[in-house]
């Protein structure tokens, strides 16, 4: 008795049902449930990065609904009381406690689908989500440490003689900034109350044969490179060009 093991080869799937918002899921179809039933005793807690403003679908252990007695979803979000949603198959009852976010719902009727959906993922949805399935053979669970990803706004400018500033504003988690060529750099991080981080890298190049510098911003939501021509004129500012 324990947690259910997902298919290790399963990749994030983009749903075709909602064209307005990208949707990601770690859930299995009925065929995969049958194939993976032998693995249900294995332990699983999945760390799952999800882009802000997308839809996310979280799924229960791969246990056939006919074997089900009760499903509960425990949702633990930072700074909020724990929310629990429950469904009892025999009486077709649903109950919940401390659940105020209307964007977190059952995908459909729990008797047809035990999955949980988050519509338009926000920073506040960062947290731990756990499905517990009560069956005659014991209780099985699957947990998700949901990490909401926020794409940083990237800017690059020259602020004084042969010095450039690259900023990755309000990203989550913090972006990583690197330069080509390498210069004499100082990096600062500013943490915001909503969990985002602004990274500011200021670099200076003494070598005069360096005329163009590139700021490369690495982030879980994708990478971005900007370049700028260094002008020797003091105080001149030059806008960055995007590759």
């Amino acid at each position: 008795e324990g947690a259910a093991q997902p298919n290790n080869s399963l990749m994030l799937q983009t749903s075709k049902e909602n064209h307005a918002l990208a949707s990601s899921s770690l859930c299995m179809d009925e065929k995969q449930i049958t194939q993976n039933y032998s693995k249900v005793l294995a332990e699983v807690n999945t760390s799952w990065p999800v882009k802000m403003a997308t839809n996310a679908v979280l799924c229960c252990p791969p246990i056939a609904l006919r074997n089900l007695i009760i499903i509960t979803w425990e949702i633990i979000l930072r700074g909020q009381p724990s929310c629990t949603k429950a469904y009892k198959k025999e009486t077709n009852e649903t109950k919940e406690t401390n659940c105020t976010d209307e964007r977190i719902t059952w995908v459909s009727r729990p008797d047809q689908n035990s999955d949980l959906q988050i519509r338009t993922v926000a920073i506040t949805h960062d947290g731990y989500y756990r499905c517990i399935m009560v069956t005659p053979d014991g209780n099985f669970h699957r947990g998700y440490h949901l990490q909401v990803l926020v794409t940083p706004e990237v800017t690059l400018f020259q602020n004084r003689n042969r010095t450039a500033v690259c900023k990755a504003v309000a990203g989550k988690p913090a972006a990583h900034i690197s330069w080509i060529p390498e210069g004499d750099c100082a990096t600062k991080q500013e943490y915001w109350s909503n969990g985002t981080v602004t990274v500011k890298s200021t670099c200076h190049w003494e070598v005069h044969n360096v005329s163009t510098v590139t700021c490369h911003v690495s982030h879980l939501t994708g990478n971005k490179s900007l370049y700028i021509e260094l002008l020797p004129v003091p105080g001149a500012k030059k806008s960055a060009k995007l590759y």
Epitope: E1, I70, E74, I76, S82, T84, A86, I132, N139, H141
Partner: antibody, heavy 121, light 110 residues
């Protein structure tokens, strides 16, 4: 085999404190709601408190509210009951019980053997 | 006084059928499931019936539960000497926001 083993009971003076523990084995502790139920000598059963699998939802009987605190450590498979400001009427055998109904449809399918708490001067 | 009302005692002879009643209100039995527990002398309680009428594995089918409105009943058929025990009904009470037990019924097998 499911086992629940209570400990921490004993004799305590009125106004004193005691911490009960319940060590669970034979099942995935973190997947179940858990409860404390007590029974005064020669009397019936009285529900004391319940806690959800993750510890986020807690309920208390009015008779212990503000004095008793239920908690759990899922990494240690242990349920706790911190009892403060104890009164003579808290004297009872305290049972730890498992709730497969997850507090939404509560019932107690496995019970420990109990630990006796005596509050007396 | 208990929220759920049970007769303090019941008795029967071996082989007989005995019924124990449990009366509550709309906030407990009327809207929530009933469980029954057996407590043999000097031991911890044991789950006998859950969800009004379901038996856990290992409980003999001589034990059966039923519910109607705000009352529940436990029936024991083919009474045996080893059935001599205290029997408790229990249910969640939505008004009290807590679990409530009946006062218990002491069953004597004559």
């Amino acid at each position: 085999e499911v086992q629940l083993l209570e400990s921490g009971g004993g004799l305590v003076q009125p106004g004193g404190s005691l911490r009960l523990s319940c060590a669970a084995s034979g099942f995935t502790f973190s997947n179940y709601a858990m409860s404390w139920v007590r029974q005064a000598p020669g009397k019936g059963l009285e529900w004391v408190s319940s806690i959800s699998p993750g510890g986020g939802s807690i309920y208390y009987a009015d008779s212990v509210k503000g004095r008793f605190t239920i908690s759990r450590d899922n990494s240690k498979n242990t349920l706790y009951l911190q009892m403060n400001s104890l009164r003579a009427e808290d004297t009872a055998v305290y049972y730890c019980a498992r709730d497969p109904g997850q507090m939404f449809w509560p019932l107690f399918d496995y019970w420990g053997q109990g630990t006796l708490v005596t509050v007396s001067s | 006084q208990s929220v759920l009302t049970q007769p303090p005692s019941a008795s029967g002879t071996p082989g007989q059928r005995v019924t124990i009643s449990c009366t509550g209100s709309s906030s407990n039995i009327g809207s929530n499931n009933v469980s029954w527990y057996q407590q043999l002398p000097g031991t911890a309680p044991k789950l006998l019936i859950y969800d009004d009428s379901h038996r856990p594995s290992g409980v003999p089918d001589r034990f059966s539960g039923s519910k109607s409105g705000t009352s529940a009943s436990l029936a024991i058929s083919g009474l045996r000497s080893e059935d001599e025990a205290d029997y408790y009904c229990g249910s969640w009470d939505a008004s009290l926001n807590g679990y409530v037990f009946g006062g218990g019924t002491k069953l004597t097998v004559l």
